[in-house]
């Protein structure tokens, strides 16, 4: 398919950076100014995309790649090619309507991004709680109880290293 | 305005050399597929040679061998460097500005004026 349509499209082999001009009987032309085209053949060249505002620009337009933004300090890229910013807020807290809020007890955060999530419930993993959980961390589930029985070690030691030439007794 | 101005042709014996040229301007000559055709007296316009931008060349059976085409995008030229003439080599030759930079089944999109290549004893 691909050989049938470069042998019928006389733009296929305009290549990236340019555009095939049908003003001027389809002979290729440079994209203009702050426009770009990323594969052969095109008709037209893209605009190229403005990081503005809240926007800021990672990588510049060329000829044959589009600007690339992310966001100023303070906000986070969310949605494919960072097609967003959304506010930053502190570890423990999540962004409501009304902006930054603490998260509920029994609940934490541990990035500046993202929602408050429950600590996880060690009992149902017959666990104890061996730290607790605070608003920016999530609880550490410690051993369960019978782990803790008599002779029984929460840590299992290291094998002792033998030496070399030395069967076990 | 795309401009395309042919020279070098004349008068060769059979067995001899001649270099067109074809001065390019009002476009991205770089980005551009460039050709030469001929047209012998009483005849159709037939293909001679194509170059793409990215210097792939493309021959008429009847000059493979004889004839080579090249280009220097910083003077804007194509040439036709034509050796072992003929008698059957005798046209006008023209310079051709290629359609969306093909040379496989290339199309035309403007022509220039011509040079008159003449073989003979």
């Known amino acids: 398919f691909e050989r049938t349509r470069s042998l019928q499209d006389p733009c296929s082999n305009c290549p990236a950076g340019t555009f095939c001009d049908n003003n001027r009987n389809q002979i290729c032309s440079p994209c203009p100014p702050n426009s770009f085209s990323s594969a052969g053949g095109q008709r037209t060249c893209d605009i190229c995309r403005q990081c503005k505002g809240v926007f800021r620009t990672r990588k510049e337009c060329s000829s044959t790649s589009n600007a690339e933004c992310d966001c100023t300090p303070g906000f986070h890229c969310l949605g494919a090619g960072c097609s967003m910013c959304e506010q930053d807020c502190k570890q423990g807290q999540e962004l409501t309507k009304k902006g930054c809020k603490d998260c509920c007890f029994g609940t934490f955060n541990d990035q500046k991004r993202g929602i408050c999530r429950p600590w996880t419930n060690c009992s149902l993993d017959g666990k104890s709680v061996l730290v607790n959980g605070t608003k920016e961390r999530d609880v550490v589930c410690g051993p369960s109880p019978a782990d803790l029985s008599p002779g029984a070690s929460s840590v299992t030691p290291p094998a002792p290293a033998r030496e070399p030439g030395h069967s076990p007794q | 305005e795309v401009q395309l101005l042919e020279s070098g042709g004349g008068e060769v014996q059979p067995g001899g050399s001649l270099r067109l040229s074809c001065a390019a301007s009002g476009f991205s000559f770089s980005i551009n597929a460039m050709s030469w055709y001929r047209q012998a007296p009483g005849k159709r316009r037939e293909f001679v040679a194509a170059i793409e931008s990215g210097r792939n060349t493309v021959y008429a059976e009847s000059v493979k061998g004889r004839f080579t085409i090249s280009r220097d995008n910083a003077k804007n030229t194509v040439y036709l460097q034509m050796s072992s003439l003929r008698a059957e080599d005798t046209a006008v030759y023209y310079c051709?500005?290629?359609?969306?930079?093909?040379?496989?089944?290339?199309?035309?999109?403007?022509w220039g004026q011509g040079t008159l290549v003449t073989v003979k004893p």
């Open positions: 051709g500005l290629l359609k969306g930079n093909r040379v496989v089944s290339p199309s035309v999109a403007y």
